[in-house]
């Protein structure tokens, strides 16, 4: 009989239904934009925009100030008033499309859907640890803007991304806007532009550089700008757009656009297609070679990575990596595979690929038929010619014109499809110690904080909790303030510690103390918590063993029982080796002697499951009484493990000492050849782990065992004779004198 401990799924060591309450702010309307500010003198603020209003919050998410940003045409609109007395049309709500910090001043810049997409500059005024907004400056000069040429028209009602870069004494706004024919006709926003903020804050300098979707493509070719960021010498925009100007506009893919952050020019504008795939370890029949494509970027964030992930990505620790969450299509619902996948694109590698693409286009010999691309922005041409020109004239450089790199950058899902049905809607990546953590918001209003690591077949969670009861999607933009991240969902802003909201979701001491150091988890009594939550004994160095089950549940009062104990924190050594004198098991008053692990029975335990087994030989003391009792495991003097040492006692009820009684045996005779089916009747015949029926000292092969009955087949007899028949349970003979008669066959 080889009983094995039942597997405990790894998920049983945590509970993601544990409620965490994190600080929040109700904005009074759907949050449209959010940005944080941290000053040099310990002052900080959170700026939250909703329709027609801008809130200023302190670091504690308490309201400090509120500003009316609309409706345009309403005299109560405070930002509108900064543009002076009239004319005030056209009336309309102000949806905030841009909310960015200009770090040079410092100032907050907000741009809305009303008033031709103009922007307002709000100087920041520190007041203690809080920040107030000074009276806004209207970045719009009525006399300098026309419908066909409007340097001060920044925001598109269809969406705009802005990154502010300091160059010398000036602030340059790198602006990317989604357009359609109607928007393009109204005060002419541009698809991509670099605009210099005028020193007197009266607007943006005229004559700025820009690229725009050509009028003939505006109806069919729309570009969504998902994210923008500045790192090193470049500003990057991430887009979702049709894969081709000529083909089906619903066939989308993701591109990265790179612009120089040191020169306000667009001659070195470059685009690169980003290809993210889910490549399951075992490919299904009919699944595409190279994995299933996830062409549509949903959210992105760039961050320096920790040592472990850096090694897996073959880059140096601290290098910047662009992380993107991708889905199969605009609706995000695939037929097979996970809903969301996460791909990592090291920035240095992106830059190298772009530079190689430029070489392919501009350095001889150029592959015939290699196109410059970006036909939605410029006239079609072949490399190395400039757009719209048949040949390169001596005074133009191939490199000084926008280019789509001819090869794409392909990566596979870091999570190996383990996000499953989760639809990720927000992403922020941080480095904590040497660990890289993805903080993700979901479609159903949850936050997942997961270690970014590639080599596992399960997710390493810091946390997985619901932000509130509304279940509304977490919005795309996430901001950091100190050691917290700010997520928006519905009309609320939530402040989530980057170390996780707490430790209560870890249910076992072992899982608790195995948590990352940065989480600050410790064990207090019977729960996992941070020190501030534990009024009593809080410690991070040891765990008691935990008994969850044992087998068998009964044993003979005389004779031994091989007891198998199940649980966790028994020895913390994969080999199952138990140092001498560390583990003491008692059943009732009786000791149970530890047995060495049978190496042939060692099974590899997948990390998604966990259970530990421990075996001992129970020999009841003479003083042991019949009846129910407890099983107790005490572990002491254990050497420290990787995360903690095992120390303490675990007690489990439910073992019973019993006395087997043999009442009847039949038949009492049978052929000398053997094979007679003997039935032994009695009580407690199945207790313990071993039993044997002996006919003249030879084992009668057991066919069935139950509490009241044993069936066995007699062995052959040496001669015709009456021979002794006995029953042993746990190696000890059950009282009674019985004989079996061998007869001629």
């Amino acid at each position: 009989e080889d009983w094995q401990c039942p597997r405990t799924p790894y998920a049983a060591s945590r509970d993601f239904d544990v409620k965490y309450v994190v600080p929040s702010f109700s904005a009074g309307g759907l949050v449209q934009a959010m940005v944080t500010y941290e000053g040099d003198r310990n002052e900080s603020a959170v700026f939250v925009a909703i329709r027609n209003r801008l809130h200023v919050l302190g670091p504690d998410l308490k309201s400090v100030q509120s500003l009316a940003t609309g409706p345009a045409g309403d005299p109560g609109c405070q930002t509108c008033a900064a543009c002076g007395p009239g004319p005030h049309g056209p009336p309309g709500d102000t949806d905030t499309k841009v909310l960015v910090l200009d770090p040079a001043l410092p100032a907050l810049v907000s741009c809305g859907s009303s008033l031709q997409g103009r922007c307002f500059l709000h100087d920041l005024e520190p007041q203690g640890t809080a920040v107030h907004l000074a009276a806004p400056a209207c970045l719009f000069s009525a006399h300098h803007n026309r419908p066909d040429d409007c340097p001060d028209c920044v925001a598109s009602p269809l969406g705009t991304r802005v990154t502010v870069v300091e160059q010398g004494q000036a602030s340059y706004f790198y602006v990317a806007s989604s357009l359609d024919a109607a928007v393009a006709a109204s005060f002419s926003p541009r698809s991509v532009s670099i605009r210099r903020l005028k020193a007197d804050a009266s607007g943006f300098a005229p004559g700025f550089v820009a690229l725009s979707v050509l009028p003939k493509h505006l109806v069919s070719y729309s570009i969504e700008y998902v994210h923008s960021f500045h790192t090193g010498a470049f500003v990057y925009f991430l887009t979702v757009q049709p894969a081709s100007v000529t083909d089906d506009p619903s066939a989308l893919h993701t591109r990265l656009a790179r612009l120089s952050a040191t020169e306000p020019e667009l001659g070195d504008y470059r685009e690169l297609v980003l290809d993210c795939r889910f490549a399951p370890k075992r490919r299904r029949r009919g699944a595409p070679e190279g994995g299933q494509p996830y062409p549509v970027l949903r959210v992105a964030h760039s961050a320096p990575v920790g040592a472990q992930l850096a090694t897996e990505l073959s880059i140096a620790e601290g290098q910047e990596v662009l992380f993107g969450v991708f889905v199969t299509g605009k609706d995000g619902g695939p037929g097979v595979g996970p809903n969301s996948v996460v791909c990592a694109f090291p920035i240095d590698l992106l830059d190298t690929l772009i530079d190689e693409g430029v070489e392919r286009c501009c350095e001889s010999p150029v592959h015939p038929g290699l196109r410059r691309g970006l036909d939605f922005f410029q006239s079609p041409s072949f490399c190395p010619n400039p757009p719209g020109l048949e040949a390169l004239s001596p005074n133009t450089s191939c490199r000084h014109f926008p280019l789509l790199v001819s090869s794409s950058f392909s990566r596979v899902d870091l999570f190996n499809g383990l996000l499953g049905p989760v639809q990720v809607t927000a992403l922020y990546v941080t480095r904590l110690d040497n660990v890289t953590v993805a903080h993700m918001g979901t479609m159903d209003g949850r936050i997942l904080q997961v270690e970014l690591v590639r080599s596992l077949n399960y997710l390493l969670y810091v946390s997985n909790f619901s932000l509130g009861d509304s279940g509304q999607p977490v919005q795309r933009d996430v901001s950091r303030l100190g050691d917290h991240l700010l997520f928006a969902s519905g009309d609320q802003v939530f402040q989530v510690p980057i170390q996780g909201p707490g430790c209560r979701h870890f249910l076992t001491c072992g899982r608790c103390l195995r948590a990352w150091h940065f989480m600050g988890c410790g064990w207090c009594g019977n729960m996992c918590g941070q020190q501030k939550e534990c009024p009593g004994s809080w410690q991070q160095d040891h765990c008691p063993p935990k008994l969850t089950e044992f087998h068998p549940h009964s044993g003979p009062l005389r004779g031994s029982t091989r007891l198998t104990l199940c649980g966790s924190n028994f020895y913390l050594h994969p080999s199952g080796l138990v140092p001498e004198g560390t583990h003491q098991v008692t059943v009732g008053q009786s000791p149970c002697r530890p047995l060495p692990k049978d190496s042939s029975k060692l099974r590899p335990v997948p990390r998604k499951d966990f259970v530990e087994e421990f075996e001992c030989e129970l020999e009841p003391l003479g003083t042991q009484a019949v009846g129910p009792t407890n099983v107790s495991l005490t572990v002491t003097n254990m050497p420290p493990g990787k995360h903690f040492r095992v120390d303490g006692t675990s007690v489990l009820r439910g073992f019973s000492f019993m006395e087997p009684v043999l009442i009847a045996v039949q038949p009492l005779f049978g052929p000398r050849a053997g094979g007679t089916c003997l039935t032994l009747e009695g009580q407690s015949l199945s207790v313990g782990t071993s039993r044997a029926v002996l006919v003249n000292g030879t084992e009668c092969l057991l066919a069935r065992v139950s509490e009241g009955q044993l069936l066995c087949a007699t062995p052959p007899g040496a001669t015709v004779a009456s021979v002794p028949l006995s029953l042993q349970v746990g190696g000890a003979q059950v009282p009674g004198s019985w004989t079996f008669q061998y007869r001629e066959d």
Epitope: D74, P75, A135, A137
Partner: antibody, heavy 121, light 107 residues
Framework: EVQLLESGGGLVQPGGSLRLSCAAS????????MMWVRQAPGKGLEWVSS????????TYADSVKGRFTISRDNSKNTLYLQMNSLRAEDTAVYYC??????????????WGQGTMVTVSS | DIQMTQSPSSLSASVGDRVTITCRAS??????LNWYQQKPRKAPQLLIY???SLQSGVPSRFSGSGSGTDFTLTISSLQPEDFATYYC?????????FGQGTRLELK
């Protein structure tokens, strides 16, 4: 304390010139539209001119267009009104006023005490 | 230009009286209307902005109402310091224009 203080008024002959100044204090002058408003003796209030925060754009009442010039020096927190070709009907108390934004949008929320300009031969 | 017409041009009342001054705009100015109080030899002071919003520090006995073309300033219970001239002003567009004023005097 938020304050506006006008100066430069006085008696001038028809056809003559005068330059009014308005010194601002207690607020970020460079953020606000500034205005001149006048009031003839025993009469009502009349808006004269306004200037953008940067000083780049200006607007005038028809009655003074081409004769008056509004300007500002944000580094000195000062507003000016250069009045040329003065006429008898320009006789008035000239007030400098701030155009409100935060708190009190779209109104003259701060006024100076006024300076008297008399055009007479 | 937007015309602003105030009535009455003058008004006699006693302390404790409820007083109403009206202002008519032509054409429609939404709620872009402000009310000012001016005492002799003093600068005007803002009482009400955006037709009905009370300026900070102004007593609550002053209130404003109306939108479009017809507006009202009400003083619920006249106090001795309220005897002054009152002006309405449109802030809808330039040129900014004022009503001709209403002189409120002690009966």
């Amino acid at each position: 304390e938020v304050q506006l203080l006008e100066s430069g008024g006085g008696l001038v002959q028809p056809g003559g010139s005068l330059r009014l100044s308005c010194a601002a204090s207690g607020f970020t002058f460079s953020k606000y539209f500034m205005m001149w408003v006048r009031q003839a003796p025993g009469k009502g209030l009349e808006w004269v001119s306004s200037i953008y925060p940067s000083g780049g754009d200006t607007t005038y009442a028809d009655s003074v267009k081409g004769r008056f010039t509004i300007s500002r020096d944000n580094s000195k927190n000062t507003l000016y009104l250069q009045m040329n070709s003065l006429r008898a009907e320009d006789t008035a108390v000239y007030y400098c006023a701030r155009w409100g934004i935060v708190g009190v949008p779209n109104a003259f929320d701060i006024w100076g005490q006024g300076t008297m300009v008399t055009v007479s031969s | 230009d937007i015309q602003m017409t105030q009535s009455p041009s003058s008004l006699s009342a006693s302390v404790g009286d409820r007083v109403t001054i009206t202002c008519r705009a032509s054409p429609d100015i939404g709620t872009y209307l402000n009310w000012y109080q001016q005492k002799p030899r003093k600068a005007p002071q803002l009482l009400i902005y955006a037709a009905s919003s009370l300026q900070s520090g102004v007593p609550s006995r002053f209130s404003g109402s109306g939108s479009g073309t017809d507006f009202t300033l009400t003083i619920s219970s006249l106090q001795p310091e309220d005897f002054a001239t009152y002006y309405c002003q449109q802030s809808y567009t330039t040129p900014l224009t004022f009503g001709q004023g209403t002189r409120l005097e002690l009966k």
